[in-house]
């Protein structure tokens, strides 16, 4: 469960996250499992550890192997394993299966291809996109932040899409490429104004001080693949990332589910070690798509730990 496959190409940057998570204040030690040799943290090294991240700048085929990360806190240690494989660059245009990230699908009205793993890197626009080694050009293709949108998708748009970007580390630039398949579904979908299923409007959630708490923001957006649908949390009207409380984090990525045939998304807000001041905050679940934005507000209240339910 706490082992993760990662792969990359030689002479490209590769950044791997420890499969075990911890607070930013926890120290993370990395080791090369075969030799139990510690990975240095000095950035002058080609391979170095930076907290939860292991950086290969650039990667070499010889770097392949299993790496151990240990998240250390004052009260516990958690161990994870990163199985890293670095491949030689292909001379032809074919991307082998072992270099492919998960397949995504789209339909005539809705198509969005995320660039895999890009969130781990320090990249700046432009993000370049290729299909079968050809740079994508024309008004049908739009690069939005970390994803590609294809307008008026046709069956011919199915294929392997590669994103290419530059990772910057202390002024040095490294190339990164990632490829995933895109399939086109012929479906009669529709899109609705977002409907938030959870939390209930003005919900009061009972939490215990000192314990962890999870809040789930869940909304449905229509039938079929949804274009630019998202759910997220705000704290006192501020994005979680801007609020600056490391104990309170949004889950990475959004989980997609289907409820009665409707396409739904949910985002979990994790509050570690709930404190008194967390009860004073306002938690807003936002659901948005092309039609508009909806929000539901949650507040926390203290749960009496001696409450007994028959």
């Amino acid at each position: 469960k706490f082992s993760k496959q990662s792969w990359g190409l030689e002479n490209e940057a590769l950044i791997v996250r420890c499969p075990r998570q911890g607070k930013p204040s926890y120290t993370v030690d990395w080791y090369y499992s075969q030799t139990n040799k510690s990975i240095p943290t000095q950035e002058r090294n080609r391979v170095f550890a930076s907290g939860q991240l292991l950086k290969f700048l650039p990667a070499a085929v010889a770097d392949s192997g299993i790496y151990t990360c240990i998240v250390r806190s004052p009260t516990f240690n958690r161990t994870g394993y990163a199985n890293v494989t670095i491949y030689k660059k292909q001379s032809d245009c074919n991307v082998p299966d072992y270099l492919m990230y998960s397949t995504v699908s789209g339909s005539e009205k809705n198509s969005k291809i995320y660039c895999p793993t890009i969130d781990l890197y320090n990249w700046t626009a432009p993000l370049e996109w290729f299909k079968n080694c050809q740079a994508l050009q024309g008004s049908r293709y739009r690069a939005h932040k970390s994803f590609l949108v294809i307008d008026n998708v046709m069956t011919e748009d199915a294929g392997d899409y590669t994103c290419k970007f530059i990772h910057n580390e202390n002024g040095a630039n490294y190339s990164v490429t990632a490829t995933r398949s895109f399939t086109v579904k012929d479906e009669q979908g529709f899109s609705l104004f977002p409907v938030i299923g959870a939390p209930a409007q003005n919900e009061i959630k009972e939490v215990e001080i000192g314990k962890n708490a999870n809040l789930t923001c869940s909304a449905c957006f229509g039938k079929g693949t949804q274009f630019l649908a998202a759910v997220l949390w705000q704290l006192n009207g501020t994005k979680i990332t801007d609020f600056g409380e490391p104990r309170i984090q949004q889950e990475e990525g959004q989980n997609q589910s289907f409820s009665n045939g409707l396409a739904c998304l949910d985002m979990v807000l994790r509050i570690a070690d709930v404190k008194e001041e967390d009860l004073l905050l306002q938690y807003d679940c936002l659901a948005l798509n092309l039609h508009g934005l909806r929000r539901h507000t949650v507040r926390l209240s203290r749960k009496n730990p001696i409450d007994h339910h028959s």
Partner: antibody
């Protein structure tokens, strides 16, 4: 100092088109959600349109949906409003306004406005 | 759509008076409410956001309160420069809607 400067207003006939621009300076435009708000002569404020910082999301008031298009060019720090099929009831001062936070529709900075008159 | 209703539509007051303007939303908007001041020929100015947070640079005689559907803007001691029209606005969901405005005139 934050500045928003609208331009492109003027007199146009019903059914005509106009493109408004709003030049922004003094803040990180590419990180800011932006809006257009209008005010008919002697009337109250009416929100017209919204665009997210990355241009991914655009929202419109029902009264302009299908006729107006909001867009932005982050490399030029400029917000646009393309107005087609204009009607007499679109006559108003059009303001561009910055939202004070992503996904918060509180408008903390406004331009001075540009007057659009739709008349034959 | 959420309707915002302000009252009164206009009021006359003297310098030094305590002035209260109310705003009612057609459904609960929690505290997602802003107040703006607008003077003739000028752009609106943000006074209060999140129902009760004072925007930077706004004098402390302005205050906001309320949650849910009923909100109040209070000017504790009216100054000559406060004669203007005031608007409430909900930012709870789209479409964004404003109240019809309250004009504060000199008595």
């Amino acid at each position: 100092e934050v500045q928003l400067l609208e331009s492109g207003g003027g007199l146009v006939q019903p059914g005509g088109s106009l493109r408004l621009s709003c030049a922004a300076s003094g803040f990180t435009f590419s990180n800011s959600d932006m809006n257009w708000v209008r005010q008919a002569p002697g009337k109250g404020l009416e929100w017209v349109s919204f665009i997210s910082s990355s241009s991914g999301y655009t929202y419109y008031a029902d009264s302009v949906k299908g006729r107006f298009t909001i867009s932005r060019d982050n490399s030029k720090n400029t917000l646009y409003l393309q107005m087609n099929s204009l009607r007499a009831e679109d006559t108003a001062v059009y303001y561009c306004a910055r939202a004070n936070n992503n996904w918060n529709f509180y408008f903390d900075y406004w331009g001075q406005g540009t007057l659009v008159t739709v008349s034959s | 759509d959420i309707q915002m209703t302000q009252s009164p539509s206009s009021l006359s007051a003297s310098v030094g008076d305590r002035v209260t303007i109310t705003c009612r939303a057609s459904q609960s908007i929690n505290n997602w409410l802003a107040w703006y001041q607008q003077k003739p020929g000028k752009a609106p100015k943000l006074l209060i956001y999140s129902a009760s947070s004072l925007q930077s640079g706004v004098p402390s005689r302005f205050s906001g309160s309320g949650s849910g559907t009923d909100f109040t803007l209070t000017i504790s001691s009216l100054q000559p420069e406060d004669f203007a029209t005031y608007y409430c606005q909900q930012s709870y969901d789209t479409p964004i809607t404003f109240g019809q405005g309250t004009k504060v005139e000199i008595k």
